[in-house]
Interface confidence: low
């Protein structure tokens, strides 16, 4: 009778994680009696995958019952394969032996390639916000993919960038990968809107890439630009004069009124206008009694815009030309805060 | 950076129950399996159950087969164990673990929490 | 269940001498046994996996060898940061089991 041929007819197979790998071997003959076991890699390193004769493999299963006595398939499948399962196995045929079985003949071999779909690309920006004209730098993040090529792109708003460099680790074999890119990015004061997103393509994507965002809403400032007007006399001892905020984001502002240097007034940006380009416009007003002044005054308007040091804006009112009225001390009308702001 | 964090541990008298949860940080929690091993005061260590990625199978010890209850919810990276029934014997630091699993099972624990003191009184 | 028997149950030593702990399993258990490292009141560390394999980031100062029932952790030259308690675990059958471990003290 011819002598057993363990018999893989599979050289390689290729699953992708989560799914079952079926790993094929069939023997030839019946003779010698004695166990089949499954091993990953060879030589005297070789991991034992599953062993006919005893041990626990909760993720190998049969698929044949290896029991009954004509059985020659010992084909078995493993559940759950992840990057980490990929490797060479082997179907080996154990000879009855006394105190051990002893190892008869193995198969050819099956090699085992994981493809594995990268994680979620996230992108993160700085901690802190930046203004326009400024450099900033953003990183994208996936891991877990298998096999190592990839690809990754950067876009600022549909608009591909160049100016990024990318690493896929590690450099040499591994079960699985990951990729990390960091790109920079130019603000400009439109960039309220703006977003950038990285985008990765693999073999396990099917086309279909994955993409991360990040929106520039979280890390640019733009810083307001003030101006400070006088209006026509409203009454014939009160002008108007307001402090129009123009162009800043994000909204966190806070205005303060200082006549001569002496704080009149502080109030929070509240009910502001939204530009199209995501900035915000504010209008606060201060109606100044001129009669409580003898000399001129200078009115100055001071914002401070997202904890950033203030900047402020100066007019000086002329009151020479106002006739004066005796018993007045008060030089600015506090109106109701909800009279402030003219939006 | 992984992190491990138990909570649920305290006093509690024999006969009554007690849920241990694990909060999972800095990895995949849904591709690991876990595990709980406890060690009583002075003593060794000694493994209490394990768990697959999806729930299932799970194996227990056989001091605390029909009593305890691991379990898993993957979109809260969370690993529990319920304890009924509890006994003086019972008393121990419970770790969890992400078990490193490989073809034939969980087979090595790393890394493992800081552990939560479970003591059964009277 | 198998039984893991570690021995000593404790070792006195110096620091640089070469220190061996041996576990033996009740039955074979081919490489599928661990070593662990736990120091007072902290959780215990992973050394060694698959009998011999150093696990990532542990000095190389710390070896591993054997198969079947009968198993070496060696520490090359002791360190001061090595004095703690060793266990092993087998990790192919249910239940897992550990050994009692042993106590590596200062001499």
């Known amino acids: 009778e011819e002598e057993l041929q363990v018999i893989q007819p599979d050289k390689s197979v290729l699953v992708a994680a989560g799914e079952t790998a079926t790993l094929r071997c069939t023997a030839t003959s019946l003779i010698p009696v004695g166990p089949i076991q499954w091993f990953r890699g060879a030589g005297p390193g070789r991991e034992l995958i599953y062993n006919q004769k005893e041990g626990h493999f909760p993720r190998v299963t049969t698929v044949s019952d290896l029991t009954k006595r004509n059985n020659m398939d010992f084909s078995i499948r493993i559940g759950n394969i992840t990057p980490a399962d990929a490797g060479t196995y082997y179907c080996v045929k154990f000879r009855k032996g006394s105190p051990d079985d002893v190892e008869f003949k193995s198969g050819a071999g099956t090699e085992l390639s994981v493809r594995a779909k990268p994680s979620a690309p996230v992108v993160s920006g700085p901690a802190a916000r930046a203004t326009p004209q400024h450099t900033v730098s953003f990183t994208c993040e996936s891991h877990g993919f298998s096999p190592r090529d990839i690809t990754l792109k950067w876009f600022k708003n549909g608009n591909e960038l160049s100016d990024f460099q990318t690493n896929v680790d590690p450099v040499g074999e591994s079960v699985s990968y990951s990729i990390h890119s960091t790109a920079k990015v130019v603000l400009t004061r439109e960039d309220v809107h703006s977003q950038v997103i990285c985008e990765v393509a693999h073999v396990t994507l099917q086309g279909d890439p994955l993409r991360g965002t990040a929106n520039l809403s979280e890390t640019i400032r733009v810083p307001p630009t003030l101006e400070v007007t006088q209006q026509p006399v409203r009454a014939e001892n009160q002008v108007n004069v307001t402090c129009q905020v123009r162009k800043f984001y994000p909204q966190r502002l806070q205005l303060t009124w200082l006549e001569n240097g002496n704080v009149s007034r502080t109030e929070t940006a509240s009910t502001v206008t939204e530009n199209k380009d995501g900035t915000y416009n504010w209008m606060s007003w201060l109606l100044v009694n001129v009669s409580a002044h003898r000399d001129d005054v200078k009115l100055t308007c001071q914002v401070e815009h997202d904890g950033q040091p203030a900047v402020s804006k100066s007019h000086d009112l002329k009151v020479s030309a106002h006739p004066k009225e005796q018993g007045s001390n008060t030089a600015a009308e506090n109106t109701g805060s909800n009279e402030r702001n003219i939006y | 950076e992984v992190q491990l964090l138990e909570s649920g541990g305290g006093v509690v008298q024999p006969g009554r129950s007690l849920r241990l949860s694990c909060a999972a940080s800095?990895?995949?929690?849904?591709?690991?399996?876990m595990a709980w091993v406890r060690q009583a005061p002075g003593k060794g260590l000694e493994w209490v159950a394990v768990i697959w990625v999806d729930g299932s199978p799970k194996y227990y010890a056989d001091s605390v087969k029909g009593r305890f209850t691991i379990s898993r919810d993957n979109s809260k990276n969370t690993l529990y164990l319920q304890m009924n029934s509890l006994r003086a014997e019972d008393t121990a630091v419970y770790y969890c673990?992400?078990?490193?699993?490989?073809?034939?099972?969980?087979?090595?624990?790393?890394?493992w929490g800081q552990g939560t003191l479970v003591t059964v009184s009277s | 269940d198998i039984q893991m028997t570690q021995s000593p149950s404790s070792v006195s030593a110096s620091v640089g001498d070469r220190v061996t702990i041996t576990c033996r399993a009740s039955?074979?258990?081919?490489?599928?046994l661990a070593w662990y490292q736990q120091k007072p009141g902290k959780a215990p560390k992973l050394l060694i996996y698959a009998a011999s394999s150093l696990q990532s980031g542990v000095p190389s100062r710390f070896s591993g060898s054997g198969s079947g029932t009968d198993f070496t952790l060696t520490i090359s030259s002791l360190q001061p940061e090595d004095f703690a308690t060793y266990y092993c675990q087998q990790a192919i059958y249910f239940p897992i089991t550990f050994g009692g471990g042993t106590k590596v003290e200062i001499k």
């Open positions: 039955q074979g258990i081919s490489s599928w």
């Open positions: 800095g990895f995949t929690f849904a591709h690991y399996g």
């Open positions: 673990a992400v078990a490193r699993e490989t073809y034939s099972g969980p087979n090595w624990f790393d890394p």
